[in-house]
């Protein structure tokens, strides 16, 4: 806290420019309107005021908006977003991309705040939706925001922000995020023709159920390992030596290489070594040939 | 990386003026404050002033304010500081720096430094 | 003006001692103080800002100390190339000022 001292003879601040840099915090204090500052505040960002002077600066805003910043003021933060805490966000009605843009900005290059947190969280709810122009900014400004999200909060975003989404931007995405997610990516690529479908697809394909990997593996594909080893066990599993054979395409030797890895090896366990045997890799751990395979789970199905 | 290029060293006369200048290049030029340190042997750092290269915006030390000049040509990306009326006391190694976050003014990067040397 | 005095123009050691360079600001600065080593012919390089963060690449037996008006930096286990010029730099308000330097020289 600065402690209330008066503006000596001839400082008082007229408007917001650089000789204030030179200002000591109690002359700040005493010298600066808070009114002038908060019309002026375009030109703040301007001047290379130093952290302990920014404390200054936020101490007369706070001052002068108790409820929270207006949008006219927020938008021209610039590096004094810095010295807001969580609680001075929540206050705050941010409903401009531009603002948004704006804050991100200052703080980009560094790990995602509490601060900017908070802002994002803001923002969003005041929109009710993650539109494809939000998905757009946040996910250039933070790669891996989607994988933040719980699958709740990601279940308001449109298929058509999918559109948006980079292959990088979902690689801390946990299975039930891409269950979320790929229902809504199955729908936005939906009138893609095949080949760029599969590009389009690939990333989301952590979230695919069964029927569209069989889907899949009819149309040439040639799925590679590394998309293939995300896929969901139980999605994988019921697939056929074929279809998997057809899912990869040239790819199919790399199955070797990971055996002992789910899903592979829970696949292996399920097929017959005979059909295995058909691959030519040496794949072992399949069901050997004159075993009767009961699938208990359908005859539960039928009691 | 950043580099920012200085020449090793100038000689001047009394009374004559002197245009020392400073090359940026590994970052982009226009974003960051360029600011300008002089040391004398045996003696401290003085911070002089800082240009900001998009905006032309100057910023001196009062002490400096009629002995230095800070200009930017944004196509070469170079920053000049031009002495004037120089005298022995202006006989110094000159310093550019950048700041990369202005909220906090500590000298990320330091050109190598221009000796000058002022004598008759 | 802020005024940062470094009060030991020298200080002598020996390469695997223990030495701390000591800076005192006229007014309360915070944390915001930077310390620059320099060498024989080369520019100041950042060694540690908001007086204990060490900048990148910076070997952890530099470490810097203290708030308000007292700073001080200490090298533990000193290597011979360790021995220069140490600044240090009030970032609390402008105009940015340093103190005159201590020189770390051999016994």
């Known amino acids: 806290e600065v402690e209330k001292t008066a503006c000596p003879s001839g400082k008082k601040a007229r408007e917001i420019d650089e000789s204030l840099i030179f200002y000591k915090k109690w002359e700040l204090e005493a010298c600066v309107d808070a009114a002038l500052l908060a019309t002026q505040m375009d030109r703040v960002n301007a001047i290379p005021f130093t952290y302990e002077q920014l404390d200054v600066l936020k101490h007369k805003l706070d001052e002068l908006y108790p409820q929270g910043y207006p949008e006219s003021v927020i938008q021209h933060l610039g590096y004094l977003f810095l010295k807001m805490s969580p609680e001075d966000i929540r206050k705050w009605n941010v409903t401009s991309l531009e603002t948004l843009k704006a804050l991100l900005e200052v703080n980009k290059g560094h790990e995602m705040s509490p601060q900017v947190a908070t802002l994002i969280d803001r923002f969003v709810k005041g929109r009710g939706q993650l539109d494809k122009d939000t998905l757009d900014t946040l996910t250039a400004f933070y790669p891996g925001y989607l994988c933040s999200l719980s699958p709740e909060e990601l279940s308001s975003v449109p298929p058509s922000s999918i559109w948006a989404v980079r292959p990088q931007d979902l690689d801390t995405c946990d299975p039930r995020q891409l269950d979320v997610l790929y229902p809504k990516a199955r729908l936005a690529f939906q009138n893609m023709n095949g080949s760029e479908y599969f590009v389009k697809i690939q990333s989301f394909l952590g979230g695919a159920p069964t029927e569209d990997l069989k889907a899949l593996s009819q149309q040439n594909v040639s799925m590679d390992l590394a998309t293939f080893m995300k896929l969901r066990t139980d999605a994988v599993l019921p697939l056929t030596v074929a279809e998997v054979q057809k899912l990869l395409g040239p790819h199919v030797e790399g199955l070797k290489a990971e055996e002992r890895h789910r899903p592979v090896r829970d696949w292996i366990l399920r097929q017959r070594q005979d059909d295995l045997d058909t691959l030519g890799l040496g794949l072992q751990g399949g069901i050997p040939n004159g075993y009767l395979v009961l699938d208990l789970s359908m005859q539960e199905a039928l009691s | 990386q950043v580099q920012l290029q200085q020449p090793g060293a100038e000689l001047v006369k009394p009374g004559a003026s002197m245009k020392l200048s400073c090359k940026a290049s590994?970052?982009?030029?226009?974003?960051?404050?360029m600011h300008w340190v002089k040391q004398r042997p045996g003696q401290g750092l003085e911070w002089i002033g800082m240009?900001?290269?998009?905006?032309?915006?100057?910023i001196y030390y009062e002490k400096f304010k009629s002995k230095a000049t800070l200009t930017v040509d944004k196509s070469s990306s170079t920053a000049y500081m031009q002495l004037s009326s120089l005298t022995s006391e202006d006989s110094a190694v000159y310093y550019c720096?950048?700041?990369?976050?202005?909220?906090?003014?500590?000298?990320?990067?330091w050109g190598q430094g221009t000796t000058l040397t002022v004598s008759s | 003006d802020i005024v940062m005095t470094q009060s030991h123009q020298f200080m002598s050691t020996s390469v695997g001692d223990r030495v701390s360079v000591t800076c005192k600001a006229s007014?309360?600065?915070?944390?915001?103080v930077a310390w620059y080593q320099q060498k024989p012919g080369q520019s100041p390089k950042l060694l540690i800002y908001w007086a204990s963060t060490r900048h990148t690449g910076v070997p952890d037996r530099f470490t810097g100390s203290g708030s308000g008006t007292d700073f001080t930096l200490t090298i533990s286990n000193v290597q011979s190339e360790d021995l220069a010029d140490y600044f240090c730099q009030q970032y609390s308000s402008y105009p940015l000022t340093f103190g005159a330097g201590t020189k770390l020289e051999l016994k």
């Open positions: 240009i900001h290269p998009n905006s032309d915006n100057t």
């Open positions: 590994g970052y982009t030029f226009t974003s960051y404050w």
């Open positions: 720096a950048i700041i990369i976050t202005p909220v906090v003014p500590k000298f990320d990067y």
């Open positions: 007014h309360d600065v915070g944390t915001s």
